[in-house]
């Protein structure tokens, strides 16, 4: 698997998308996990609803949410209030019993907030020793809702 890079701004939200073959992974729950070291295990952060039919419902674990479009074949993970410690390597997974198929390897990069003039020295970027030659960068820089902004359109 190639690694896809998603970049987000500190303090804002980052949306990660993982496309997959909906027919191949039919009926399977999905998960978002964090890679612990280059060859270490992938530690589960959040998984979709226990009932596959309800996979579209957003499930949260702390500041991380997951939702699955099972027909369209897109798993979406939202990292809210992105922090430097959120940077790192993750995986989108399809679960079948004890097996976990990797749908996408994701490298999350946290960029400094251009409006924040504090020291950005603690922000994380992959070091030169880390090889992401095949990485595909997806800029997914989003912003937080402004005060008074309505998250959903009003229903008539």
């Amino acid at each position: 698997h190639n690694t896809t890079v998603f970049q987000g701004v500190a303090g804002q939200s980052l949306q990660v998308s993982c496309p997959y073959d909906s027919m191949k992974h039919w009926g399977r729950r999905k998960a978002w996990c964090r890679q612990l070291g280059e060859k270490g295990p992938c530690q589960r952060v959040v998984s979709t609803h226990n009932l596959w039919l309800l996979s579209f419902l957003r499930r949260w674990n702390g500041s991380t949410a997951i939702t699955d479009d099972t027909l369209g074949g897109t798993l979406t993970i939202t990292l809210r209030n992105l922090q430097p410690h959120d940077a790192g390597l993750y995986q989108c997974q399809s679960l079948h019993g004890s097996e976990a198929d990797t749908l996408r390897k994701v490298l999350v990069e946290v960029l400094a907030d251009p409006l924040d003039h504090r020291d950005a020295g603690d922000l994380w970027f992959p070091g030169e020793s880390e090889s992401f030659e095949d990485a595909h960068v997806e800029h997914s820089i989003s912003r937080s809702l402004l005060e008074g902004e309505i998250p959903f359109p009003p229903t008539s």
Partner: antibody, heavy 122, light 106 residues
Framework: EVQLVQSGAEVKKPGESLKISCKGS????????IGWVRQMPGKGLEWMGI????????RYSPSFQGQVTISADKSISTAYLQWSSLKASDTAMYYC???????????????WGQGTMVTVSS | EIVMTQSPATLSVSPGERATLSCRAS??????LAWYQQKPGQAPRLLIY???TRATGIPARFSGSGSGTEFTLTISSLQSEDFAVYYC????????FGGGTKVEIK
């Protein structure tokens, strides 16, 4: 009509190789998993492995891992089960089956081939 | 791997009577369970999927129930064509089958 048609019966000697086939028709062959099931004479059903012809992703039952090879050629809508060196204990009926799916998220083997009888005897 | 255990191995029933077949999983398989019928010289036929949903064309006398580790297939009134071997199968982790229950004429 949705169907799976398997190759004919085989009689082989121990140590010989063999490849049997399962051809799908009447549906999108690349979009459904195909499983292989063994039934030894007078015995029950045993799941051997499964393949997704769309990308040839393959899973094996621990009992059959390393004993057989499952493959597929999506250009001719055919799945295969092969042995590099047959044993007398491989004598059995072998079925291929399509893993059907329903809107509830359930899956099960809904379409079955007619079976291929493999006899291994010296 | 998950082990599926069926009981009884053989069930002797008279036509018109009710037959109850059991299937137990070594660990929870949620509702990811199917039942198949196999007659001599024929390929298996899907009866029930998702533990309780009848497959297309399957008569209403066949019903499935249970979830987790305990499952039941009930044939409310046995017809002559129902005498066969029945298998349960889980697809929660792999696709293992039970050993089968032979339903024979009493």
């Amino acid at each position: 009509e949705v169907q799976l048609v398997q190759s004919g019966a085989e009689v082989k000697k121990p140590g010989e190789s063999l490849k049997i086939s399962c051809k799908g028709s009447g549906y999108s062959f690349t979009s459904y998993w195909i499983g292989w099931v063994r039934q030894m004479p007078g015995k029950g059903l045993e799941w051997m492995g499964i393949i997704y012809p769309g990308d040839s992703d393959t899973r094996y039952s621990p009992s059959f891992q390393g004993q057989v090879t499952i493959s597929a050629d999506k250009s001719i809508s055919t799945a295969y089960l092969q042995w590099s060196s047959l044993k007398a204990s491989d004598t059995a009926m072998y079925y291929c089956a399509r893993l059907g799916r329903w809107s509830s998220g359930s899956t099960a083997f809904d379409i079955w081939g007619q079976g291929t009888m493999v006899t291994v005897s010296s | 791997e998950i082990v599926m255990t069926q009981s009884p191995a053989t069930l002797s029933v008279s036509p018109g009577e009710r037959a109850t077949l059991s299937c137990r999983a070594s660990q929870s398989v949620s509702s990811n369970l199917a039942w198949y019928q196999q007659k001599p010289g024929q390929a298996p036929r899907l009866l029930i999927y998702g533990a309780s949903t009848r497959a297309t064309g399957i008569p209403a006398r066949f019903s499935g129930s249970g979830s987790g580790t305990e499952f039941t297939l009930t044939i409310s009134s046995l017809q002559s064509e129902d005498f066969a071997v029945y298998y349960c199968q889980q697809d929660d982790d792999g696709y293992t089958f039970g050993g089968g229950t032979k339903v024979e004429i009493k």
